[in-house]
């Protein structure tokens, strides 16, 4: 695999980095004191991630644009690819250091190697993502991120096999968001809910991020989303491929979502 765009593509890292995940408060972003962040991670059977654990996760593509508490009162967030709105153009753990004021409010980075994780970082050429518990209904209060990281030059063909999320006009309760980028900040494609199968989506590059969020109320059947790696197209067949892509783009924009 080698090193490309700040990611060391080596599946050995998956084992070591498994178990790091990002948590927000019930009331939203940047609402947890250190004690609360610690309690949330411990209640779920883990503990606050150490700097090393967060860095190990980052090295296999864990990228979140939200500062969170780590072990020993440290605050930071993992950046795989630098961007103008996140990470000050740097890669690595953006480190705010050990905070003297433990009452400051941030998110949390938990570590639990035994957790039934939802989401993760995927470098396989094809994979199916399922909502937690599928085919049973998903749980309330879930946040899952699936980060797809393929070989440089490949693109991602995303298709929805099953889809049933709580329906509401703005998709504010339960939703899947798709981003044509490393994170859930850039390249917003759409927010989806309800029970209509969204159209296929084709990425513009070799990375994509899916975010699933469920609130504390109604649940539904959940989803299965499949992706397949598309190899780089040769010059001779590029015309055909471009037309497929633009049709795909038109279709997914007509899907059941609201722009943020």
């Amino acid at each position: 695999w080698g090193f490309k765009d700040g990611i060391f593509h080596n599946s050995i890292w998956l084992e070591r980095a498994a178990g790091v995940y990002h948590r927000e408060a019930r009331s939203g972003k940047y609402k947890l004191t250190y004690a609360e962040a610690k309690a949330v991670c411990e209640f779920e059977g883990g503990h606050l991630a150490t700097y090393k654990q967060l860095e190990a996760a980052r090295k296999i593509g864990f990228h979140v644009c939200a500062a969170g508490w780590m072990a020993k009162g440290r605050v930071g967030y993992p950046i795989v690819k630098p961007g103008p709105n996140c990470g000050f153009g740097k890669t690595g753990i953006i480190d705010y250091g050990i905070r003297l004021n433990r009452s400051e409010r941030w998110d949390a980075y938990c570590y639990n190697p035994h957790a039934k994780e939802c989401g993760g970082v995927f470098t396989d050429p094809k994979q199916i993502f399922k909502s937690p518990g599928f085919p049973n209904e998903y749980e309330d209060n879930q946040i899952c991120y699936w980060h797809i990281r393929l070989k440089y030059g490949q693109r991602i063909h995303l298709s929805f096999l099953d889809f049933d999320l709580e329906d509401d006009p703005g998709c504010l309760a339960d939703y899947v968001e798709i981003y044509d980028s490393y994170d859930d900040v850039h390249g917003f494609v759409g927010r989806y809910c309800g029970d209509e199968l969204p159209d296929d989506i084709i990425s513009t590059g070799n990375v994509m991020t899916l975010k699933f969020l469920s609130d504390a109320s109604v649940t539904a059947g959940g989803f299965q989303i499949k992706y397949v790696a598309m190899d780089p197209v040769s010059k001779s067949s590029q015309g055909k491929n471009t037309s497929t892509t633009s049709t795909g783009n038109k279709n997914f924009l007509a899907g059941r979502f609201s722009h943020l």
């Epitope: 408060a25 009331s27 309690a39 039934k116 518990g133 749980e139 309330d140 504390a216």
Partner: antibody, heavy 118, light 113 residues
Framework: QVQLQQSGAELARPGASVKLSCKAS????????INWVKQRTGQGLEWIGE????????FYNEKFKGKATLTADRSSSTTYMELRSLTSEDAAVYFC???????????WGQGSTLTVSS | DIVMTQSPSSLSVSAGEKVTMSCKSS????????????LAWYQQKPGQPPKLLIY???TRESGVPERFTGSGSGTDFTLTISSVQAEDLAVYYC?????????FGGGTNLEIK
């Protein structure tokens, strides 16, 4: 110190409306969900709804939709519950409670007693 | 909605005795993601708001005496008081915190003989 200070006892006529208040510390108001719970004399507890003042999200028990409206005033860090079209069934003690980031209510107001009588 | 059923509705015991009360939910309160049960127990004394005793079905809130123990998983839960004290006179409620609408059991009224 977390405190939820509720308004005093209210006496209202059937068919009228009443607005109960729950004043929180700024920290609690901004960072947590504020819930309302009903308890009729000698009865159990019924959850009415929850509001998140930081983002305006509000969730109701279907049973109380149309009966209760939850609002929040940022300037005073106060959450309100308005009850309309009052009947004798609405006579109860109403508690506001803060929901922790873990699955429980960790702080409660002292309760506001509503009497409905003509 | 998840229905919470408590039993018995009341019980009368002497100080020092062991007490067990039950709470059953109409749906599982186990979160499959983290394998935690989203059930809490509260104690309510006359004229006061409820006070948290146990959360996550079995985690004792800080400051709560060790004689209070919560157990159970899925749909069947138990609160045990190993040696009842006079100050334990109260109504005990279980609460579903798994999903909206949050629901409470009807309560178990503990009287001291």
């Amino acid at each position: 110190q977390v405190q939820l200070q509720q308004s005093g006892a209210e006496l209202a006529r059937p068919g009228a409306s009443v607005k109960l208040s729950c004043k929180a510390s700024d920290d609690t108001f901004i960072n947590y969900g504020i819930n309302w719970v009903k308890q009729r004399t000698g009865q159990g507890l019924e959850w009415i709804g929850e509001t998140f003042p930081s983002n305006g999200n509000t969730f109701y028990n279907e049973k109380f939709k149309g009966k209760a409206t939850l609002t929040a005033d940022r300037s005073s860090s106060t959450t309100y519950m308005e009850l309309r079209s009052l009947t004798s069934e609405d006579a109860a003690v109403y508690f506001c409670a803060r929901h922790s980031n873990l699955p429980y209510f960790d702080h409660w107001g002292q309760g506001s007693t509503l009497t409905v009588s003509s | 909605d998840i229905v919470m059923t408590q039993s018995p509705s009341s019980l009368s015991v002497s100080a020092g005795e062991k007490v067990t009360m039950s709470c059953k939910s109409s749906q599982s309160l186990l979160n499959s993601g983290n394998q935690k049960n989203y059930l809490a127990w509260y104690q309510q004394k006359p004229g006061q708001p409820p006070k948290l005793l146990i959360y996550g079905a079995s985690t004792r809130e800080s400051g709560v005496p060790e004689r209070f123990t919560g157990s159970g998983s899925g749909t069947d839960f138990t609160l045990t008081i190993s040696s009842v004290q006079a100050e334990d006179l109260a109504v005990y409620y279980c609460q579903n915190d798994h999903s909206y609408p949050f629901t409470f059991g009807g309560g178990t009224n503990l009287e001291i003989k």
